[in-house]
């Protein structure tokens, strides 16, 4: 009986790489979930509720476009040379929402928009496109709108705290608001080269009566209308020779 | 004992995908050999002796170049989309040696050079480069050589059987022979479009005294000096959706 | 060389690709904005000696040194990426490509 | 995630990549002009649950329907091509790329 038991143990040993208990659909899905988190370099699944997503998800053309192309699953994707990281996800577009910054707090303590925090992983020379998207509230009568994007700087001797990035003039008709994008590639590249120079920006979109139409801190019913930065990068996968 | 035997058989069945007898180096090499033939779309290994290779292998710059770069094994190779054939070998360069043709036989029965046979798999629009390489025997005194490549055509009413493809004039000094390449891309593309028009070519390389220096049928000690065609193709892998 | 496709009703015992859909909504991964689900597929079945053996690089070289290897396995021989749009938990939405997420073909390896 | 490299002296029992050279001259394949030999490598070793599991697309979905599958196998997870110069037996010399001829990485799949 003992030798039979031993023989069975040996057979089991021979098959240890081949028998997998609990081969169920759920265990297979669990394995894929672990994979995805690992490939995205996430330790755990981001803890974000449906409501938070509804609030944060920009209601803007770039998002629609990304969602509309999502099911084109198979791109011609380069297999990469031996040196390339063919395991981790590669990033093509980063959409960054504004966060709060001490420097942007006004005298009365009310925050000003906007400060964008960047990962040190984004290399300035990999930025292909950078656009600041802002939502302009609807107008009641036809009007010309003056959009101004200012960059915060350390206070100069004469008290200047801003320097212009972009300004544009556009006509608006009554109806729904519109999304407007502004090229900020050069500014972003400078911020990435010198992170300490990124103190934030101020957005103004004044109509002929001086009313600011730019949604900087969304009010009720304005979920998803925050300003955001759309950054397209060429992600040459990290070299990870093993 | 019978139930024990049955249990063992079941255990064996469970492991049938997992135990592989004769897991030796030679069996592994054999499997790789089968793979290579399959990937090259060859049913068996070409039956060619070392001597035959010595005779056939052109002693020309393109061959040296290919052999010199062979160990650059890992190119950035595209993974291909779902539709691409990522199993079979892709062809980049085809070196074709001349074969015999009935049409090229002279009245006295001595074959004329050269007839090149092409696979119907080569598509004319995939040809990037096509060069005819010819070897010119060494000369004893400095001389001008007139190289003429003629294309055979069906005899016309006036008896014309040739039409010119290329002619060039070059100076040769005493010493070793030289390899000369001639662009024949257009001719090759026409042959591929209309295979029936490929009746062969005649190569002439006359010095100032009318001696033909072109090696068309290698004599003793002239192994590897046959004319040959070097064709570079863009091999977009065959679509093989399953 | 090119892999069999099966479904849950197949009687095929040999190495085959079977459908499997990963539904992110079903397990509450709302942080993945798109796709909401995708077809991952999986490999299953028996491997005879050279059946469907695309990459014969698994079995042992030295019989005397088994190292627990399992011989030819039914495993993916071709995979493709998916594009994904997701929150990364840092106030950022990322659109990128994740390699080797879909099994296109199975074989014995 | 990224595969272990071993040699014939390794005591590693887990899934690992081992060296293997294919020598065309040694078995008389003179029709292959270049390379005369190349490093193919191979995979061998044991697979625990998620150890080195790069592509978790092999194990069964329905426990009730085993179909002879062998669970996680030590198998190539990254392969690369080689360029080859060879006679094709039709008076032609071909230079081309053969996909998936070198094992760059092994994993449990």
């Amino acid at each position: 009986e003992n030798s039979e038991q031993k023989e069975n143990v040996e057979k089991e040993g021979l098959c240890n790489a081949c028998t997998w208990r609990q081969n169920t659909k759920s265990s297979r899905i669990e394995a894929i979930k672990i994979q995805i988190l690992s490939k995205l370099r996430l330790e755990t699944a981001p803890n974000i509720s449906k409501d938070a997503i509804r609030q944060l998800l920009p209601k803007a053309p770039p998002l629609r476009e990304l969602i509309d192309q999502y099911d084109v699953q198979r791109d011609d994707s380069s297999d990469g040379s031996l040196e390339d990281d063919d395991y981790h996800a590669t990033t093509e577009t980063i959409i960054t929402m504004p966060t709060e910054s001490d420097f942007l707090m006004q005298v009365d303590g009310k925050p000003k928009c906007c400060f964008f925090k960047f990962s040190s992983k984004i290399q300035y020379n990999k930025v292909v496109k950078a656009q600041l998207w802002i939502y302009l509230r609807p107008v009641e009568t036809p009007t010309t709108v003056f959009v101004q994007i200012l960059r915060l700087i350390k206070p100069m001797k004469d008290g200047t705290r801003y320097t212009g990035i972009r300004s544009l003039k556009l006509d608006m008709n009554p109806g729904t608001g519109i999304w407007q994008s502004i090229d900020v590639k050069t500014v972003l590249q400078n911020w990435l080269k010198q992170p300490e120079s990124n103190l934030g920006i101020e957005i103004k979109a004044l109509d002929e009566n001086g009313h600011d139409l730019a949604v900087t801190f969304p009010g009720p019913g304005e979920d998803g209308l925050n300003p955001f930065l759309e950054v397209k990068v060429t992600d040459t996968p990290k070299r990870s020779r093993r | 004992e019978n139930s024990e035997q049955k249990e063992n058989v079941e255990k064996e069945g469970l492991c049938n995908a997992c135990t592989w007898r004769q897991n030796t180096k030679s069996s592994r090499i054999e499997a790789i050999k089968i793979q290579i033939l399959s990937k090259l779309r060859l049913e068996t290994a070409p039956n060619i002796s070392k001597d035959a290779i010595r005779q056939l292998l052109p002693k020309a710059p393109p061959l040296r170049e290919l052999i010199d770069q062979y160990d650059v094994q890992r190119d950035d190779s595209s993974d291909g989309s779902l539709e691409d054939d990522d199993y079979h070998a892709t062809t980049e360069t085809i070196i074709t040696m001349p074969t015999e043709s009935d049409f090229l036989m002279q009245v006295d029965g001595k074959p004329k050079c050269c007839f090149f046979k092409f696979s119907s798999k080569i598509q004319y629009n995939k040809v990037v480069k096509a060069q005819l390489w010819i070897y010119l025997r060494p000369v004893e005194t400095p001389t001008t050589v007139f190289v003429q490549i003629l294309r055979l055509i069906k005899p016309m009413k006036d008896g014309t059987r040739y039409t010119g493809i290329r002619s060039l004039k070059l100076d040769m000094n005493p010493g070793t022979g030289i390899w000369q390449s001639i662009d024949v891309k257009t001719v090759l593309q026409n042959w591929l479009k209309q295979p029936e028009s490929n009746l062969g070519i005649e190569i002439k390389a006359l010095d100032e005294n009318g001696h033909d220096l072109a090696v068309t049928f290698p004599g003793p000690g002239e192994d590897g000096l046959n004319p040959f065609l070097e064709v570079k193709v863009t091999d977009t892998p065959k679509r093989s959706r399953r | 060389d090119f892999g069999l496709d099966c479904d849950e009703h197949s009687t095929e015992s040999r190495c085959c690709r079977y459908p499997l859909t990963v539904d992110f909504e079903a397990f509450g991964w709302d942080w993945i904005i798109a796709p909401k689900r995708y077809k991952a597929n999986y490999c299953s079945g028996e491997c005879e000696f050279v059946f469907l053996q695309k990459y014969p690089h698994t079995h042992l070289v030295h019989q005397a040194n088994p190292r627990g290897s399992a011989g030819p396995c039914c495993t993916p021989t071709k995979m493709s990426p998916i594009n994904m749009l997701y929150f990364n938990g840092k106030e950022q939405i990322i659109y990128g490509k994740i390699p080797a997420m879909v099994v296109d073909r199975c074989g014995c390896s | 995630d990224f595969g272990l490299d071993c040699d014939e002296h390794s005591t590693e029992s887990r899934c690992c990549r081992y060296p293997l050279t294919v020598d065309f001259e040694a078995f008389g394949w003179d029709w292959i002009i270049a390379p005369k030999r190349y490093k193919a490598n191979y995979c061998s070793g044991e697979c625990e649950f998620v150890f080195l599991q790069k592509y978790p697309h092999t194990h069964l979905v329905h426990q009730a329907n085993p179909r002879g599958s062998a669970g996680p196998c030590c198998t190539p997870t990254k392969m690369s091509p080689i360029n080859m110069l060879y006679f094709n037996g039709k008076e032609q010399i071909i230079y081309g790329k053969i996909p998936a001829m070198v094992v760059d990485r092994c994993g449990c799949s």
Partner: antibody
């Protein structure tokens, strides 16, 4: 003044190619998606396709292979080209700002142009 | 293909009455809320009423409201006015560049 206006032939013969132009004013096509929608006489609305702010195109499944949408941002124009026209393609063709069903897309429409396909 | 079904095909009500129009999609719209409602009167282009399933478009009277999520949606006109006589269409977005309109509900005022 923000407007969209469709223009093109009123009558097209079967098998011919239809080319319609949507000319916009007060709209920057580099920031705005433009959609095409059609409506057969007495029938409902039918989505035809989109050209996105960034130039990507999305077509209804029935229109793939026959439809091309392009734009010339400098001329403020979006062009719809549909090959192999058939009498069933007789409809009023509209262009609209944005994408109906996404956000406030479809908040602004052209007046539409009636295209009749007949020999 | 995606099918969006609107019911009823025709709705005949008196001024001041409450109108309830239904729209059912054969598959869930993207993000559960990629759905808009349009009003169209004869000889005119459509007019946007509701987007994100429940958000009232600019300049649309508050008697119009939208509700629902996923596959089932409702447009409600709390108190019908004579000018509300029109055909109403729902439009759904599904991601992957797929969009569809319902076949429409005609609202008549008695």
């Amino acid at each position: 003044q923000v407007t969209l206006k469709e223009s093109g032939p009123v009558l097209v013969k079967p098998t011919e190619t239809l080319t319609l132009t949507c000319t916009v004013s007060g709209i920057d096509l580099s920031h705005t998606d433009i959609s095409w929608v059609r409506q057969a006489p007495g029938k409902g609305l039918e989505w035809v396709g989109i050209i996105s702010y960034a130039g990507k195109k999305y077509y209804a499944s029935w229109a793939k292979g026959r439809l091309t949408i392009s734009k010339d941002t400098s001329k403020n124009q979006v062009v719809l080209t549909m090959t192999n026209m058939d009498p069933v393609d007789t409809a009023t063709y509209y262009c609209a700002r944005g994408v109906p069903a996404y956000s406030h897309g479809g908040d602004l429409w052209g007046q539409g142009t009636l295209v009749t396909v007949s020999s | 293909d995606i099918v969006m079904t609107q019911s009823p095909a025709t709705l005949s009500l008196s001024p001041g009455e409450r109108a309830t129009l239904s729209c059912t999609s054969s598959q869930s719209v993207y993000h559960a809320n990629w759905l808009s409602w349009f009003q169209q009167k004869p000889g005119q282009p459509p007019k946007l009423l509701i987007y994100w399933a429940s958000t009232l478009a600019y300049g649309v009277p508050s008697r119009f409201s939208g509700s629902g999520s996923g596959t089932d949606f409702t447009l409600t006109i709390s108190s019908l006015q004579p000018e509300d006589a029109a055909t109403y269409y729902c439009a759904g977005g599904y991601g992957g560049g797929r969009y569809a309109f319902g076949q429409g509900t005609k609202v008549e005022i008695k």
